[in-house]
Interface confidence: medium
């Protein structure tokens, strides 16, 4: 149940549709583990990027990390910064995009690697999954054909995020991953950083749609660390 | 907390209909799907398929497609299990399961 | 016919250590697809022991691990005890049946 997906569902290489079950639509805004929209953020482009305040990476989207926008600038002025692509120079995890981590100061692929697209690579962190599967993709591709006209619709089992129709993320819903839907504004999300500490989500939402980011919603900046809620919010 | 209530024991003929109930409390019904496995007598568990509780979409196991139909009621946070043209090997224990939490089962014996 | 094999049977005397293998297919655990391991002690209904291949749920004592290779998923009992006389089950999703399956089995006595 894994494999790297969220720079723009890369993988393209696919089982199934079948299994899972499906969306909430009615549940704009409830905490609850288990809702069926499950989450973290995608990778974004950001046009009008509007600067975001931040105290630490937590407060940002998935694409973006907490930093001064000048090198050396005052470190009390911090923003949220889009996140550096592959080959540009990075100091921690949090700074490369999803896809990416932060190795010899270098934002490097995490395709060969077990830092992998911010849902997928929850999954595999924290679900244990042995790698030895994973290494060559193509091992895929000797299921049966038949697997692999249409994608899948919500509740369909997948493996990645490719696997499933528009709209949809491949997520975790403890037995399996199935297709959920991406979630709307307003809706809350879960924040994941890429620093191999994650919670074990055994119920996962998707990741907020295009031109949403998930950030700490502006009311519950005082709450503790624990207790704030990220919802999807326009950039 | 989470639980699963199920219907009670049940003795059917064969050919008969049998149709049980789960109902789930201390949780967002609406918000999970729910399996449905049975267990024959000294046998393993064997799945049947899921419903999701939102939407009232249903997947079957090839096994049982044709004979069983699977629904829910949101109003009341059930879910039920009807399984047609009873046969003596469907005498099992059938668990609804939210898969993380299972219900204690149904007994269910078919006999003439 | 369950298409995840375990062996049926599996005995150690307390504090020994035991191993359930369960075996599947490029369609089921080598596809990629999770393995959970269920205890299911004599008239009860499964609990879950091991998800997503080898976490374990909070209250779940730290005598069960789970792992995964290739298209074999098991389970391993350190130090085992009374208590863990019971039915074993391994599950995965299989994409060639387009469904959930469990294993076959096995039953772990204590000696």
């Known amino acids: 149940t894994l494999n790297s997906v969220l720079n723009s569902n890369a993988i393209k290489n696919l089982p199934p549709p079948l299994g899972g079950a499906a969306g909430h639509p009615g549940s704009a805004v409830s905490a609850a583990p288990g809702i069926l929209y499950p989450g973290g953020n995608k990778y974004q482009t950001i046009d009008n990027y509007q600067p975001y305040p931040c105290a630490e990476d937590e407060e940002c989207g998935t694409d973006e990390y907490c930093a001064s926008p000048t090198r050396g600038g005052d470190a009390g002025v911090q923003i949220c910064l889009a996140c550096r692509k592959r080959r540009k120079r990075c100091m921690r995890h949090a700074m490369c995009c999803p896809g990416n981590y932060c190795k010899n100061g270098i934002c490097v692929s995490s395709d060969q690697n077990h830092f992998r697209g911010e849902i997928e690579e929850t999954i595999t962190e924290s679900f244990g999954n042995d790698h030895s599967t994973l290494d060559g993709y193509s091992r895929r591709t000797t299921l049966s054909s038949k697997m692999y006209h249409t994608k899948g619709q919500e509740g369909s089992v997948c493996l990645r995020s490719s696997d499933c129709a528009s709209g949809l993320c491949c997520a975790r819903h403890f037995w399996s991953k199935i297709c959920k839907p991406v979630l709307k504004e307003g809706q809350v999300c879960t924040k994941h950083r890429r620093k191999g500490s994650h919670g074990l989500e055994i119920f996962q939402r998707c990741y907020c749609g295009e031109g949403l980011s998930c950030r700490i919603q502006k009311d519950h900046h005082q709450a503790s660390n624990s207790s704030r809620l990220h919802t999807c919010q326009r950039h | 907390q989470v639980q699963l209530l199920q219907s009670a024991a049940e003795v059917k003929k064969p050919g008969e209909s049998l149709k049980i109930s789960c109902k789930g409390s201390g949780y967002d019904f609406p918000g999970y799907y729910l399996h449905w496995v049975r267990q024959a007598p000294g046998q393993g568990l064997e799945w049947m398929g899921w419903i999701n509780a939102n939407s009232g979409a249903t997947n079957y196991a090839q096994n049982f497609q044709g004979r069983v139909t699977m629904t829910r009621d949101t109003s009341i946070s059930a879910a039920y299990m009807e399984l047609s043209s009873l046969r003596s090997d469907d005498t099992a224990v059938y668990y609804c399961?939210?898969?993380?939490?299972w219900g204690r089962g149904t007994t269910v014996t078919v006999s003439s | 016919q369950s298409v995840l094999t375990q062996p049926p049977s599996a005995s150690g005397a307390p504090g020994q250590r035991v191993t359930i293998s369960c075996t599947g297919s490029?369609?089921?655990?080598?596809?990629?697809?999770?393995v959970h391991w269920y205890q299911q002690l004599p008239g009860a209904a499964p609990k879950l022991l091991i998800y997503g291949n080898s976490n374990r749920p909070s209250g779940v004592p730290d005598r069960f691990s789970g792992s995964k290779s290739g298209t074999s998923a098991s389970l391993a009992i350190t130090g085992l005890q009374a208590e863990d006389e019971a039915d074993y089950y391994c599950q995965s999703y299989d994409s060639s049946l387009s469904g959930y399956v469990f294993g076959t089995g096995t039953k772990v006595t204590v000696l």
């Open positions: 399961t939210r898969e993380d939490h």
């Open positions: 490029s369609s089921n655990i080598g596809a990629g697809y999770d």
